[in-house]
Interface confidence: low
């Protein structure tokens, strides 16, 4: 049978390398040989490409090279397939070769702000080497954060003759590290060279872009003042690498404006010891260019009632995420503070704070918790400037197995019966909540029993033992992740019973 | 012609500061960035930073960072650097230098004559 | 920042003599260095920028090659006046950083 027709030809110019055109070679059952005939010139010369590849999918693609390709020409491509059957020819195709070309990657050797011009970066680079004198190039620059994933572009072009191959990159983040990559072809041609290596480079630095502040609220003192503990970060979405010299910070009574207090630190979080009254605490970051927008929060008098609107809250591991999720019956307030720390026995140091907006649910990496340690998790509601009464739940980011097991005491031996006594693991040895414990026991040389009972339960009484038997016992603690044994303890029921 | 014209010798004592001066003339002071270099006795070049005079935006070497202060004068088209916390081992020729931006970036075309700071207790 | 590398730290040649001064970049600069000839007692003098382009006013026996990591410089007739010591410079961005030099001297 004849080849099958060669279909869907396409042809690459690699500007001044090579030109390169595939096809389609269809389904072929004897060996085929393919012919490219092109014309050129502007069709005042021609010649032939053969394909010598006995491997079917490199003889469907055949390649003109230099000296005898130059820019701007128009060609036609026609590719014939042989056998021993017979000849078939394509249909005729026609190119141009500015529409077809393609070119190396520009190299970008500069990314660098513009002194005292904010939010832009400079892009300096060498246009590549072997492009066509005679045509302009179109660009496409891309650009991220380096912390992001998601590319934006931007696309323009450069008369040939423009010697200053630079672009101004502007509406960026200000004191923020972008990735850069810049692809470039000629105007006419469908073909975009690859993306050039990426380089780095950093907007100016600005005035602080702001704070968000929150507090901790302590119980009064002797003498009815109260300590607040304030704590603030920057605001959300400002540059990571945002640098601050101090914060100023003031506050006042709510009655009283006049009674404005102010002090000046360079920490991030400050003791407050204030009266019994509401108060108005406002602050500002600032450094050498300036400073931020006043962030301020109000904090409630000791005696003030706050609102209660939570009414269900649990936390679940997802997708290396812990999730917590509540319910609430005020559809007003659409706020949230979540307060998060590990729940040790001594006064939490590492309190973590973040604000949700427009939804009842906060997520957080797996990995930014401490795997095997119980957080406290506290949800406030926000409604204006009143803080609601909080939720607290205990949530484990990842449960891991006890790492040791409950202590075990053996108590009220008699002949057939004994009970078996268990403390808590403590805190830090727990590695997740406990659902259960597990109580093993054995005759000696006889057959072993279990018995599984929920995690508030730290006694159990064992029955129908035999009398006079030495028996080994040992508690297993459990968490999802799997349990641990406590000690093993020997026992011997009694041989008789006063109440016997 | 292009002349960069700096201050006389200093003699100081280490933890002072010394200020060395470099009046430009013969171009537009503001359409050139002004580095500063220095060289110890024997030694080779090392770049201090750079001014540019038009908005007074500065970059500085990492290793003098703490330590120095470059400013530009434009109604007198003087360029300053400024060396705090003196040691021995700052005694050195200063030297300010234009940049040759039309020609290529970060090439220092025309040099001061340098000053000398001698810093001895 | 990009370490500059220069070889040898000091030759002895004639008038006349063809010699040849290497500089090699820890990263790539593509075509972004410079030469500097300092004489004693005087500033350094610009010779040679984007590795190859005279500067004004410098003889042609001057001539700068190399792209990338590895330049050279190149006197093709050694005269009395050119008796000084050498320094590359990249001048691809910020911090500047030179070679160690090389000292040309009479043989």
């Known amino acids: 049978a004849l080849p099958a027709k060669p279909e869907n030809i396409s042809c690459v110019y690699y500007y001044r390398k090579n030109l390169t055109c595939t096809w389609s070679p269809g389904k072929e059952t004897s060996y085929t040989q393919y012919t490219v005939k092109r014309t050129y010139a502007f069709g005042e010369k021609h010649d032939n490409c053969t394909t010598n590849s006995s491997t079917s999918e490199n003889r469907a693609s055949c390649s003109f090279f230099l000296p005898r390709i130059t820019i701007p020409d128009n060609y036609t491509i026609e590719v014939e397939a042989e056998n021993g059957d017979g000849v078939i020819k394509s249909h005729m195709t026609y190119w141009r070769l500015e529409n077809i070309a393609k070119t190396e990657p520009p190299k970008i050797f500069r990314v660098k702000p513009v002194l005292g011009i904010k939010r832009m970066i400079q892009i300096e680079w060498i246009k590549p080497e072997l492009a066509p004198v005679s045509s302009d190039l179109k660009y496409t620059l891309r650009f991220r954060t380096v912390n992001s994933t998601s590319w934006m572009e931007v696309n323009f072009a450069k008369n040939r003759k423009d010697k200053n191959q630079t672009y101004n990159l502007t509406g960026l983040q200000p004191f923020t590290e972008y990735v850069i990559a810049l692809r470039c072809a000629v105007k006419e041609s469908k073909f975009w060279s690859d993306w050039s290596q990426e380089k780095m480079g950093m907007t100016e630095e600005e005035a602080p872009c702001g704070l968000e502040l929150w507090r901790v609220l302590k119980p009064a003192e002797a003498d009815g003042r109260r300590p607040v503990r304030l704590l603030w970060k920057k605001a959300r979405g400002a540059p990571v690498l945002e640098k601050t010299l101090g914060y100023n910070i003031w506050y006042y009574p709510e009655s009283n404006t006049n009674l404005t207090e102010t002090m000046n630190t360079t920490n991030q979080q400050l003791e407050l010891h204030l009266g019994g009254e509401s108060f108005w605490v406002s602050m500002i970051s600032y450094n050498s260019l300036g400073k931020s927008p006043v962030a301020t929060l109000r904090i409630p008098a000791i005696q003030e009632k706050s609102f209660q609107c939570i009414e269900v809250m649990q936390a679940c591991v997802a997708e290396d995420q812990l999730v917590v999720k509540w319910q609430s019956s005020a559809l007003d307030v659409n706020t949230w503070m979540i307060e998060w720390f590990p729940d040790v026995d001594s006064e939490p140091t590492t309190l973590s704070w973040e604000s949700v907006s427009q939804a009842t649910n906060w997520t957080i990496q797996q990995d930014k918790l401490k795997p095997f340690w119980c957080y406290n998790i506290s949800v406030y509601p926000m409604l204006h400037d009143k803080v609601g009464e909080p939720y607290s739940i205990q949530a484990y980011a990842k449960e891991g197995v006890p790492s040791e097991g409950p202590e075990t005491k053996v108590e009220n031996i008699g002949v057939k019966t004994v009970t078996i006594t268990w403390k808590e693991i403590p805190k830090s040895e727990r590695k997740g909540i406990i659902c259960n414990y597990t109580i093993f026991y054995q005759a000696e040389g006889g057959k072993g029993f279990s018995k599984t009972v929920n995690s508030s339960i730290l006694q159990y009484g064992l029955e129908s033992l035999k009398r006079k038997t030495s028996y080994i016992v040992q508690v297993m603690a459990s968490t999802s992740a799997g349990g641990t044994n406590g000690t093993s303890i020997n026992f011997k029921t009694l041989s008789f019973s006063v109440f016997e | 012609q292009v002349q960069l014209v700096q201050s006389g010798a200093e003699v100081k004592k280490p933890g002072a500061s010394v200020k060395v001066s470099c009046k430009a003339s013969?171009?537009?002071?503001?359409?050139?960035?002004m580095n500063w270099v220095r060289q110890a006795p024997g030694q080779g070049l090392e770049w201090m930073g750079l001014?540019?005079?038009?908005?007074?935006?500065?970059s500085y070497n990492q290793q003098f960072q703490d330590r120095v202060t470059i400013t530009a004068d434009k109604s007198t088209s003087t360029a300053y650097m400024e060396l705090s916390s003196l040691r021995s081992e700052d005694t050195a020729v200063y030297y300010c230098?234009?940049?040759?931006?039309?020609?290529?970036?970060?090439?220092?075309?025309?040099w001061g004559q340098g000053t000398l700071v001698t810093v001895s207790s | 920042d990009i370490q500059m590398t220069q070889s040898p730290s000091s030759l002895s040649a004639s008038v006349g003599d063809r010699v040849t001064i290497t500089c090699q970049a820890s990263?790539?600069?593509?075509?972004?260095l410079a030469w500097y000839q300092q004489k004693p007692g005087k500033a350094p003098k610009l010779l040679i920028y984007?590795?190859?382009t005279e500067a004004q006013g410098v003889p042609s026996r001057f001539s700068g090659s190399g792209s990338g990591t590895d330049f050279t410089l190149t006197i093709s007739s050694l005269q009395p006046e050119d008796f000084a010591t050498y320094y590359c410079?990249?001048?691809?961005?910020?911090?500047?950083?030179f070679g160690g030099g090389t000292k040309v001297e009479i043989k």
């Open positions: 990263e790539d600069i593509y075509s972004f």
């Open positions: 013969g171009y537009t002071f503001t359409g050139y960035i």
């Open positions: 410079q990249h001048h691809y961005d910020s911090p500047l950083t």
């Open positions: 230098a234009r940049d040759g931006y039309d020609d290529g970036p970060y090439t220092l075309e025309t």
């Open positions: 984007n590795a190859q």
């Open positions: 001014i540019n005079p038009y908005n007074g935006g500065t």
